[in-house]
């Protein structure tokens, strides 16, 4: 039975040219996390494997910094980065948990960060 829940940064906005941290947290389960995948729609951004470390997709290679933690920092944002992002936690023995973040990249300088990542 899958008891875990994914908490995410939720809906966030950032300014064009800036950077943003995509962050998820798996709670309420003792399952072992073996890998975390970060995807944008159906495109793979990065993989963090417990044994092999990080792999960054070539198309994002120059502007992704792994971390903080299992999160992902996306730099040099463009309006094309607007959209849905998914953190996919592969765990044993529970299976797969998925969290969703929506990022809006704004042209103006009035972009405000949405819900900050905090565990209540």
């Amino acid at each position: 039975m899958m008891t875990g829940t994914i908490e995410t940064t939720g809906n966030i906005s950032a300014e064009k040219g800036g950077s943003i941290i995509l962050q998820c947290h798996l709670s309420s389960t003792t399952a072992q996390v073996t890998q975390v995948n970060w995807e944008q729609q159906d495109q793979l951004l990065a993989i963090c494997n417990a044994d092999l470390g990080w792999h960054i997709s070539p198309s994002f290679k120059d502007r992704v910094a792994p971390g903080p933690g299992l999160g992902l920092t996306l730099q040099s944002l463009t309006v094309n980065d607007t959209g849905e992002y998914f953190c996919i936690y592969h765990t044993y023995p529970d299976g797969t948990y998925t969290g969703r973040i929506f990022l809006e990249v704004l042209e103006s300088s009035v972009a405000e960060h949405g819900a900050r990542f905090q565990i209540p």
Partner: antibody, heavy 118, light 106 residues
Framework: QAYLQQSGAELVRSGASVKMSCKAS????????MHWVKQTPGQGLEWIGY????????TYSQKFKDKATLTADTSSSTAYMQISSLTSEDSAVYFC???????????WGQGTSVTVSS | QIVLTQSPEIMSASPGEKVTMTCSAS?????MHWYQQKSGTSPKRWIY???KLASGVPARFSGSGSGTSYSLTISSMEAEDSATFYC?????????FGAGTKLELK
């Protein structure tokens, strides 16, 4: 087993720069963040920043962004940190440490001692 | 930035005594990591992801906590446990450490 070997102690003049190295072995260097940490008796452990050798992207603590420069050479599995415009406050032991799964620093170098003389 | 406050700063314990030290975060974090450092050596990862023991760490050590409150416990103090213990978070940038708890043998 991962292992981090740091360069030897440095005695440098005030105002000069110093560049130290951290040679990694026992793992795929380009797949893990390399963090740098400063330790002084008065300040404890302070995070300087990190580099992801796979793409060279760096992130710095605000305090050190104009003081330290992080680089990495994947061909030799070596990370470097240069500290510029040295003052007595830069006298410390500097550690490199590998970023493990989940954000803990799982392997540490033995440290490089930097002494700034006037 | 997230400030980590460790208490006590210094403590002493007799062999066989139970020891608990705490780490309080200024904002909620998802995990806490702990390091042991002995004089003249580099820190060693000791407890990670709040409660997992690093390889080679004796089972008398344990970690627990959530949100803003975390702790490291030694069920029965031994002489070799004398060291300074640091907590660390990387929930957000910058990564931060606590100031450390120095544990001495009484």
């Amino acid at each position: 087993q991962a292992y981090l070997q740091q360069s030897g102690a440095e005695l440098v003049r005030s105002g000069a720069s110093v560049k130290m190295s951290c040679k990694a072995s026992g793992y795929t260097f380009s797949n893990y963040n390399m963090h740098w940490v400063k330790q002084t008796p008065g300040q404890g452990l302070e995070w300087i920043g990190y580099i992801f050798p796979g793409n060279g992207v760096t992130t710095y603590s605000q305090k050190f962004k104009d003081k330290a420069t992080l680089t990495a050479d994947t061909s030799s599995s070596t990370a470097y940190m240069q500290i510029s415009s040295l003052t007595s406050e830069d006298s410390a032991v500097y550690f490199c440490a590998r970023g493990g799964f989940g954000g803990a620093l799982d392997y540490w170098g033995q440290g490089t001692s930097v002494t700034v003389s006037s | 930035q997230i400030v980590l406050t460790q208490s006590p700063e210094i403590m002493s314990a007799s062999p066989g005594e139970k020891v608990t030290m705490t780490c309080s975060a200024s904002s909620s974090v998802s995990h806490m990591h702990w390091y042991q450092q002995k004089s003249g050596t580099s820190p060693k990862r000791w407890i990670y992801d709040t409660s997992k023991l690093a390889s080679g760490v004796p089972a008398r050590f344990s970690g627990s906590g959530s949100g803003t409150s975390y702790s490291l416990t030694i069920s029965s103090m031994e002489a070799e446990d004398s060291a300074t213990f640091y907590c660390q978070q990387w929930n957000n940038n910058p990564l931060t450490f606590g100031a450390g708890t120095k544990l001495e043998l009484k």
